[in-house]
């Protein structure tokens, strides 16, 4: 029994769960999901026993082995693989166990303004970038770009200080997790702060 | 200094099969997004395709899906190109890409390596 | 796909001229555009991404503008050394494209 492999997949992309058997005279070999049964193999009889009919066409054995291959990957496969190895020269089955962790392609993210004041030409607010879905570990980086200025902010929340008179600057968020990145339609200082321009001190949303 | 270099090129029948290597150095080749791209000769630049950090995605022009594995190994600092049926306009020097700060522009480029393929 | 068409194909100029070329992309890409410097014999240098923001080291003649379907980089005073071919290229969706290239030569 080897430590726990994590495996990262894409949903409706495929993932194979490697295993190397040394054991030499194998009578059965068993792939649990979540502790229920998935597949079952006797090399014997050649005989590959899929527990659910929904994961018949999902499940493959490449190359002859026994290192399983799962394909149409959904999000709720994320979860705890184990497979145990079986032969009456064991006195124990020969086990390794698994985390899958399926994760969604990334749509483009979305910016919504906070409060926005304007004071002495300043104007001053935040710009929160979010995943219209939520998706889970999404990590989230902003690039403000101009002539000024070409630097990265870490996090969802940019906050944004711009002086009227200043060069015109563009924010672009862009959100990674394991398996995509995408990023935000570029959005402009000058744009945003337009709305707050005729009072100078407007607080708007 | 980092510094992609790539091998395996050489000339190959049409019909052929040819793996391209790039060995990285000098950063954390297993934090990047990798690319490959190619040029044939006097001609423009064509992207082939990326493949994330940990190998769960890999993304491919359409028009070379079905001919051209992307893989790499992150234990190794290597990017692999295997090209399967390769014809005449198959021709061409295959860079490996870096893209900068792991966005979508490349910073970083092999010196490339040249694939001819000739009877 | 995106299709970026390049114009004009080749640019022949003298050293000290303003040198302008153009990147149109057959659909809107946002500010997703970079464009590529590529020597004779050489690899390609990023020179500029985000459609206007020059990489570090690049010389300040160096410039790009535009945004959605028309793109530009322009150099704004030739120099020997910026003879080389240029591509631009999109980001914006999959696949990757890059525009055929306008070389830039020196009368």
């Known amino acids: 029994s080897g430590p726990v492999k994590e495996l990262v997949g894409s949903v409706g992309g495929a993932v194979t769960f490697p295993l190397k058997s040394k054991v030499k005279q194998v009578d059965s070999i068993v792939w649990t999901f979540n502790t229920t049964p998935l597949v079952t193999i006797q090399p014997e009889g050649g005989t590959i026993i899929v527990t659910q009919n929904r994961n018949r066409e999902r499940v493959d054995f490449p190359d002859g082995g026994y290192s399983l291959k799962l394909s149409k990957l959904k999000k709720n496969d994320s979860g705890i693989y184990y497979v145990g190895i079986y032969s009456s020269s064991l006195q124990q089955p020969s086990t390794q166990e698994y985390v899958l962790h399926v994760y969604e392609h990334l749509s483009k993210p979305k910016v919504t303004m906070g409060l926005q004041s304007n004071k002495n030409g300043t104007c001053v607010t935040n710009l929160t970038c979010c995943m219209e879905h939520g998706e889970e570990d999404v990590i989230y980086t902003w690039k403000a770009l101009g002539q000024a200025a070409n630097e990265s902010h870490n996090g969802s929340i940019l906050p944004i200080s711009w002086r009227w008179g200043e060069s015109d600057m563009t924010f672009i968020c862009v959100a990674r997790n394991p398996v995509s990145r995408n990023f935000s339609s570029p959005i402009l200082a000058r744009k945003l702060c337009e709305g707050a321009a005729d009072d100078p001190d407007s607080s708007m949303v | 200094e980092v510094q992609l270099v790539e091998s395996g090129g050489g000339l190959v029948q049409p019909g052929g099969s040819l793996r391209l290597s790039c060995a990285a150095s000098?950063?954390?080749?297993?934090?990047?997004?990798m690319s490959w791209v190619r040029q044939a000769p006097g001609k423009g630049l064509e992207w082939i395709g990326e493949?994330?950090?940990?190998?769960?995605?890999?993304n491919y022009a359409p028009s070379l899906k079905d001919k051209f594995i992307i893989s790499r190994d992150n234990a190794k600092n290597s990017l692999y190109l295997q090209m399967n049926s390769l014809r005449a306009e198959d021709t061409a020097v295959y860079y490996c890409?870096?893209?900068?700060?792991?966005?979508?522009?490349?910073?970083?480029w092999g010196q490339g390596t040249l694939v001819t393929v000739s009877s | 796909q995106i299709v970026l068409s390049q114009s004009p194909a080749i640019l022949s100029a003298s050293v000290g001229d303003r040198v302008t070329i153009t990147c149109k992309a057959s659909?809107?890409?946002?500010?997703?555009v970079a464009w590529y410097q590529q020597k004779p014999g050489k690899v390609p240098k990023l020179l500029i991404y985000?459609?206007?923001t020059r990489h570090t080291g690049v010389p300040d003649r160096f410039s790009g503008s535009g945004s959605g379907t028309d793109f530009t980089l322009t150099i704004s005073s030739l120099q020997p050394e910026d003879v080389a071919t240029y591509y631009c290229?999109?980001?914006?969706?999959?696949?990757?494209?890059f525009g055929q290239g306008t070389k830039v030569e020196i009368k």
């Open positions: 985000w459609a206007s």
């Open positions: 659909q809107d890409v946002g500010i997703a």
């Open positions: 493949i994330n950090p940990d190998s769960s995605t890999i």
């Open positions: 890409a870096r893209p900068d700060g792991n966005y979508w522009y490349f910073d970083v």
């Open positions: 290229q999109q980001y914006s969706s999959y696949p990757y494209t």
């Open positions: 000098g950063f954390d080749f297993s934090r990047y997004w």
